[in-house]
């Protein structure tokens, strides 16, 4: 790399992939090993991310630009820039402190990822229960009894003994 | 570069707002920006951390919960609100900026002091 | 809460010798680990990141080494301008409920 010979600012004529080496004169150097400028005139270089454990690269970091990560089979991303990666839960389930745990009766999560939440209270919205909710999913709630003409068939409530919503084991 | 700034002598139980200032580059680009602090005479202590991309994530260090509030202002600045704040806070901030998601920073700032004294 | 813990606290080397600083984290950390260098008045500049590589304009006589627990920095033929103090520093991101990030407590390099 040549030295630059800006008036203004020697730096500024340092291209990315490179930094202004203080140590050499001001001389534009190419960054070093795991490392990378992705703007021109940069006084130092910038570390690149390294996808190690369960993270897996994504894209190589290049003297241009960082790596990416995401996380490898059975983990998924969490945090910025997937920071993070999180264990996989199935359906109707889970992550807590002590590994997954199948949602509690009244709740459910489609995902394999985030928490169990309740199911919709269709009577709030004067609504039937038109389809049962399960740990895996939501209640569908159906038009309100008054809606029904008379013959016509709804879902029956199963009996509480029977904890609706588990599917089987 | 990064500079900080709104360093001051405050009387304790006061509060406080630092500012970090980047140029030469955009908070818009997926970097950390943490703030460390330094007593007189003493070591480094890592207080908080705010991806400045699109999430804006924030990390801080466990003594620092409730008290300190780490925020991305503008698409060049990051801000540092402290609360309740006593001598044990009298220290040189520094903002700190980095790539590699491991807590490891290139790029520093000057530093600015707080000095918590009544 | 991850701790680093830094040894010795102050070393004397003469002029061409050599100067060695230990660190050890308090858990694994893998290769997580930053080496940095501070004179009185600045802030820290950033010598050796990922345990071994070195960063940006550091002088090749600044070599990093180490993984898991334990870290050490070494500076060979060691030169005036290299008195300061160093620290290291380990961590990652693991939760916003549990994340983990220090420094050691420095080493101050005297050179003779």
């Known amino acids: 790399f040549e030295r630059t010979r800006s008036l203004q600012d020697p730096c500024s004529n340092c291209p990315a992939g490179t930094f202004c080496d203080n140590n050499r004169n001001q001389i534009c150097s190419p960054c070093p090993p795991n490392s990378f400028s992705s703007a021109g005139g940069q006084r130092t270089c910038d570390i690149c991310r390294q996808c190690k454990g369960v993270f897996r690269t994504r894209k190589e970091c290049s003297s241009t630009s960082n790596a990416e990560c995401d996380c490898t089979p059975g983990f998924h991303c969490l945090g910025a820039g997937c920071s993070m990666c999180e264990q996989d839960c199935k359906q109707g389930q889970e992550l807590t402190k002590k590994g997954c745990k199948d949602c509690c009766f009244g709740t459910f999560n489609d995902q394999k990822r985030g928490i169990c939440r309740p199911w919709t209270n269709c009577s709030l919205d004067g609504k039937s229960v038109l389809v049962n909710g399960t740990k895996e999913r939501d209640v569908v709630c159906g038009p309100s009894p008054a809606d029904l003409s008379p013959g016509a068939s709804s879902v029956t409530p199963p009996a509480p003994a029977r904890e609706p919503g588990h599917s089987p084991q | 570069s990064l500079e900080e700034s709104g360093g001051d002598l405050v009387k304790p139980g006061a509060s406080l707002t630092l500012t970090c200032t980047a140029s030469g580059f955009s908070f818009s680009s997926n970097y950390w920006i943490c703030w460390v602090r330094q007593a007189p005479g003493k070591g480094l202590e890592w207080i908080a951390c705010?991806?400045?991309?699109?999430?804006?994530?924030t990390y801080y260090a466990s003594w620092a919960k409730g008290r300190f509030t780490i925020s991305k202002t503008s698409s060049t600045t990051v801000t540092l609100q402290m609360t309740s704040l006593t001598a044990a806070d009298t220290a040189t901030y520094f903002c700190?900026?980095?790539?590699?998601?491991?807590?490891?920073?290139?790029?520093w700032g000057q530093g600015t002091l707080v000095t918590v004294s009544s | 809460a991850l701790v680093m813990t830094q040894t010795p606290a102050s070393v004397s080397a003469a002029v061409g010798g050599t100067v060695t600083i230990n660190c050890q984290a308090s858990?694994?950390?893998?290769?997580?680990l930053a080496w940095y260098q501070q004179k009185p008045g600045q802030p820290p500049k950033l010598l050796i990141f990922?345990?071994?590589d070195l960063a940006s304009g550091v002088p090749s006589r600044f070599k990093g080494s180490g993984s898991g627990t334990e870290f050490t920095l070494t500076i060979s033929g060691v030169q005036c301008d290299d008195a300061a103090t160093y620290y290291c520093q380990g961590g990652y991101y693991t939760s916003s409920a549990d994340t983990r990030g220090a420094f050691g407590g420095g080493t101050e390099v005297v050179v003779k």
């Open positions: 990922y345990a071994s």
């Open positions: 700190a900026r980095d790539s590699s998601s491991y807590y490891m920073f290139n790029l």
């Open positions: 705010i991806y400045v991309g699109s999430s804006g994530d």
């Open positions: 858990e694994d950390i893998d290769t997580y």
